[in-house]
């Protein structure tokens, strides 16, 4: 049974030409942790593995950093990075789990990080 | 350089046996994901089976679900498909494959012909 | 299972051709598709990954795009060598699944 949930930065936003973190965190579940795969809408930006470490699409390397930790920092941001992003947890034995984030990129200054909020 | 190498293919009778070995070279084995593919005589290509490196899943097509065993010993850095009850349409040439993070399959070795024929 | 259609399942075309074949999903696969060439007695070997990544060592000459249900391999300008079977394959979720192939003759 999947017990565990993720819990993200949830609703962001950050300015255009910043930067921003994206993470997620997997919790109340003992399930070992694999892999995780980062998507924005239908494009996979990135994957760490347990055993492999980091991929970073190619088309994404000059703006896409890994980490901290299982998280991803996107670089030099634009307006058409606004969206939604998803970290998909692979995990052992209990199977995925996704977490979803939205991220505005603002043109101008105010740029206010929404609240955190759990998915199960 | 990466090398995959499968041996163990050859001619069986309907309902008979053989063990398929991949002997890999090159790269760290025990950090990827394998997987087996055939290549039935004229056809295109079928998955078999796959291992995670990390926690050692395995899963199989539903054509050979029960019959075939995919396995690895990361100390001798080799993958291995054992395979039961072998029909007629099990013919076919089986390549093993690296599977970097489980995505895709980057490296195959140069196949193994499997005969089932009476 | 997701089934994935290839068309067209071969074509004729000459050097310095552009070729385009698509590949279609039952169902969304996000980016999770690959493309590999086959010649005739070899294995396989990897073009693109993730829809849109160039493996390591392949021409520039090939591309791929496309996300969730419909994708695309280019050959920007076919060469002598790029006579060959060209294969699609998902891996957004197990059985693996692969298309059923194309076959790219000289006119």
């Known amino acids: 049974m999947m017990t565990g949930t993720i819990e993200t930065t949830g609703n962001i936003s950050a300015e255009k030409g910043g930067s921003i973190i994206l993470q997620c965190h997997l919790s109340s579940t003992t399930a070992q942790v694999t892999q995780v795969n980062w998507e924005q809408q239908d494009q996979l930006l990135a994957i760490c593995n347990a055993d492999l470490g980091w991929h970073i699409s190619p088309s994404f390397k000059d703006r896409v950093a890994p980490g901290p930790g299982l998280g991803l920092t996107l670089q030099s941001l634009t307006v058409n990075d606004t969206g939604e992003y998803f970290c998909i947890y692979h995990t052992y034995p209990d199977g995925t789990y996704t977490g979803r984030i939205f991220l505005e990129v603002l043109e101008s200054s105010v740029a206010e990080h929404g609240a955190r909020f759990q998915i199960p | 350089e990466v090398q995959l190498l499968e041996s163990g293919g050859g001619l069986v009778q309907p309902g008979g046996s053989l063990r398929l070995s991949c002997a890999a070279s090159?790269?760290?084995?025990?950090?990827?994901?394998m997987s087996w593919v055939r290549q039935a005589p004229g056809k295109g290509l079928e998955w078999v089976a796959s291992?995670?490196?990390?926690?050692?899943?395995?899963y199989y097509a539903d054509s050979v679900k029960g019959r075939f065993t995919i396995s690895r010993d990361n100390s001798k850095n080799t993958l291995y498909l054992q395979m039961n009850s072998l029909r007629a349409e099990d013919t076919a040439v089986y390549y093993c494959?690296?599977?970097?993070?489980?995505?895709?399959?980057?490296?195959w070795g140069q196949g193994t012909l499997v005969t089932v024929s009476s | 299972d997701i089934q994935m259609t290839q068309s067209p399942s071969s074509l004729s075309a000459s050097v310095g051709d552009r070729v385009t074949i698509t590949c279609r999903a039952s169902?969304?696969?996000?980016?999770?598709l690959n493309w590999y060439q086959q010649k005739p007695g070899k294995a396989p070997k990897l073009l693109i990954y993730?829809?849109?990544s160039l493996q390591s060592g392949v021409p520039s000459r090939f591309s791929g795009s496309g996300s969730g249900t419909d994708f695309t391999l280019t050959i920007s300008s076919l060469q002598p060598e790029d006579f060959a079977t060209y294969y699609c394959?998902?891996?957004?979720?197990?059985?693996?699944?692969f298309g059923g192939g194309t076959k790219v003759e000289i006119k």
């Open positions: 494959a690296r599977e970097p993070y489980s995505v895709w399959l980057d490296y």
């Open positions: 090159g790269f760290t084995f025990s950090s990827y994901a």
């Open positions: 993730a829809a849109s």
């Open positions: 394959q998902q891996s957004y979720s197990t059985p693996l699944t």
């Open positions: 169902q969304s696969i996000s980016s999770y």
């Open positions: 291992i995670k490196s990390n926690t050692g899943s395995t």
